[in-house]
Interface confidence: medium
């Protein structure tokens, strides 16, 4: 039975050219996290594997940095980065948990940032 829940940064916005941290946190389960996938719509951005560590997709290696923690840092943002991002936690024995984040990249310099997410 899957008892865990995913907390995310939710809906966030950032300025074009800036950077943003995407964070998810899995709680309320004792399942072991074996891998976390970060995906944007249908594209795989990065993977953090418990055995092998971080792997960044070659298509994004210039603009994506691992961490902090199991989060992901997006750099040099463009308006094309606007959209849904998913953190997919592969766990044993529970199975898969998915969290959703919506990022809006704004042209304006008055982009309103969401509250900074803290891992408890």
């Amino acid at each position: 039975m899957m008892t865990g829940t995913i907390e995310t940064t939710g809906n966030i916005s950032a300025e074009k050219g800036g950077s943003i941290i995407l964070q998810c946190h899995l709680s309320s389960t004792t399942a072991q996290v074996t891998q976390v996938n970060w995906e944007q719509q249908d594209q795989l951005l990065a993977i953090c594997n418990a055995d092998l560590g971080w792997h960044i997709s070659p298509s994004f290696k210039d603009r994506v940095a691992p961490g902090p923690g199991l989060g992901l840092t997006l750099q040099s943002l463009t308006v094309n980065d606007t959209g849904e991002y998913f953190c997919i936690y592969h766990t044993y024995p529970d199975g898969t948990y998915t969290g959703r984040i919506f990022l809006e990249v704004l042209e304006s310099s008055v982009a309103e940032h969401g509250a900074r997410f803290q891992i408890p």
């Epitope: 074996t34 996938n37 594997n49 418990a50 055995d51 092998l52 792997h55």
Partner: nanobody, 125 residues
Framework: EVQLVESGGGLVQPGGSLRLSCAAS????????MGWFRQAPGKEREGVSA???????TYSDSVKGRFTISRDNSNQILYLQMNSLRAEDTAVYYC???????????????????WGQGTLVTVSS
């Protein structure tokens, strides 16, 4: 940290067979896919075969029907059974590991960041 150690290479005559093994150690969960690559003298490293999520397998055109990849999950050992060997199969063979996901099961080395030291296979009469 995962470490990969290949064995089973050697000298074999054309038409002969060899079985390569790759033992993984230092893992916590074993949640990754694995592949075999090779590098012939003076050539670039190329993908040979991989075993991916759900036990799916893939092979390069040059070895399809001659080589068989398999994996012993309980002992974290990867195998490559090589039959009908040819002179052009001569190379150093490497095993590699990458994260497991449900995307394409291909032989791109981009996602393989953990490599063994290699084992030499020489096919000659």
């Amino acid at each position: 940290e995962v470490q990969l150690v290949e064995s089973g290479g050697g000298l074999v005559q054309p038409g002969g067979s060899l079985r390569l093994s790759c033992a993984a150690s230092g893992y916590k969960y074993g949640v990754y896919s694995m592949g075999w690559f090779r590098q012939a003298p003076g050539k670039e490293r190329e993908g040979v075969s991989a075993i991916c999520s759900g036990g799916r397998t893939t092979y390069s055109d040059s070895v399809k029907g001659r080589f068989t990849i398999s994996r012993d999950n309980s002992n974290q050992i990867l195998y490559l059974q090589m039959n009908s060997l040819r002179a052009e199969d001569t190379a150093v063979y490497y095993c590699a590991a990458r994260p497991l996901w449900t995307g394409d099961c291909d032989l791109s080395s981009s996602w393989y960041k953990t490599w063994g030291q290699g084992t030499l296979v020489t096919v000659s009469s």
